[in-house]
């Protein structure tokens, strides 16, 4: 029951996380900035991974896609890639985890298969969450670096004096959505991995413990014990640990009505 709850909760948390990663990737508010201020109007700017928008205090709003703009930071492509990889991995993970859910029965799927699928989806969620966190963090770092580099930078251009204006910028809402969503996906993935351990069938190999009451020769055989998770299981009747004693296959035992196996 606890395993099912852990798996189900992990799935839901990851689902919310991936939805958040998708939302963050699509959002325009990765960074916000005051571009212009005068007594009558102010121009605010908010930028996303795909387009930049200006909003004026008068109500005017205009968004423009980056398209093939040469002046874009190279890091932007890396952030886009990280976020997309995160979404793709997360989506595949969700698909896999649906079939891995203990509460869903699909044909005669064994528990070991479900455990494997749960682990796979868990790992995918972890990597997806890390991609999102990395993407958002790289963007935040790029933002801080670029603003500091361009502050108070003055030079002469072909059209006359060119100066960089000191403007205030802030991290946009998308950064916080991305960080939280990435964290949730990561937590969901960890929960799936934890659930996988409980889902795996417990394969127990008990070796025979025989009590021979016949005659004066009493043989007590402490047998080896193995609890397996289903990965690299001891399917053949191999000797694991015998503590110096021999198994039933190795010693001749005289049948007796007092023999217990």
């Amino acid at each position: 029951m606890a395993v099912t709850a852990c798996q189900g909760l992990g799935f839901v948390v990851s689902l919310i996380g991936i939805a958040g990663i998708i939302a963050a990737t699509c959002m325009d508010q990765w960074s916000t900035q005051d571009l212009y201020n005068n007594p009558v109007t102010a121009v605010f700017n908010y930028q996303g991974l795909w387009r930049s928008c200006v909003r004026e205090s008068s109500g005017f709003t205009e968004c423009r896609g980056y398209f093939t703009l040469l002046g874009l930071p190279a890091m932007l492509q890396a952030v886009r890639a990280l976020m997309i990889v995160g979404i793709v991995l997360g989506a595949i993970g969700l698909l896999v985890s649906i079939f891995a859910l203990k509460c869903i029965r699909i044909g005669s799927m064994e528990d070991s298969a479900k455990a494997n699928m749960t682990l796979t989806s868990g790992i995918m969620f972890i990597v997806s969450g890390l991609c999102a966190i990395a993407g958002v963090s790289v963007f935040a770092n790029m933002l801080v670096t670029n603003f500091w580099m361009s502050t108070a930078n003055m030079y002469t251009g072909m059209g006359g004096m060119v100066q960089t204006v000191q403007t205030r910028y802030t991290f946009g809402a998308a950064l916080f959505v991305g960080w939280v969503a990435g964290g949730l996906t990561l937590i969901g993935g960890v929960m799936m991995c934890i659930a996988c351990r409980g889902l795996a069938p417990e394969e127990t190999n008990y070796k025979a413990v025989s009590y021979h009451a016949s005659g004066h020769s009493v043989a007590y055989k402490p047998g080896g014990f193995k609890a397996s998770t289903g990965f690299g299981s001891n399917t053949k009747n191999k000797k694991i640990y015998d503590g110096g004693a021999r198994t039933e296959d190795e010693v001749q035992s005289y049948p007796s009505k007092h023999d217990y196996v």
């Epitope: 960074s31 900035q33 571009l35 212009y36 009558v40 109007t41 121009v43 700017n45 930028q47 930049s52 200006v54 004026e56 205090s57 008068s58 109500g59 005017f60 205009e62 423009r64 980056y66 703009l69 040469l70 002046g71 874009l72 930071p73 932007l76 790029m142 933002l143 670029n146 603003f147 580099m149 361009s150 502050t151 930078n153 251009g157 072909m158 059209g159 006359g160 004096m161 060119v162 100066q163 960089t164 204006v165 000191q166 403007t167």
Partner: nanobody, 120 residues
Framework: EVQLVESGGGLVQPGGSLRLSCAAS????????MEWYRQAPGKGRELVAT???????YYADSMKGRSTISRDNAKNTVYLQMNSLKPEDTAVYYC??????????????WGQGTLVTVSS
Amino acid sequence: EVQLVESGGGLVQPGGSLRLSCAASGSFFRIVAMEWYRQAPGKGRELVATITRGGSTYYADSMKGRSTISRDNAKNTVYLQMNSLKPEDTAVYYCNVRVEVPFMQPNDYWGQGTLVTVSS
């Protein structure tokens, strides 16, 4: 890089009118605001008028009621129509554009200036 070409300056009589224009060209992302400044001989540079991308305008008290700023977004051009000119309006008029640079500080580009002389 942005190039600004100003035109329309010259000698005008007091009470006369003049229309200045400033065209921006080159590779840039988006012009956020376009402004006209002026600098009289021996004085500092002062703002005359501003127009934002959305069309919001702002005028300095010195030219309020006597000037009109307009822009053509498609041509990236700003115009300053000045009426009822006075001798104290004599100055070098500079065009300034504020250009948005994605993920960086915006840039202010200045023109070379056009001289307006109000004299009889």
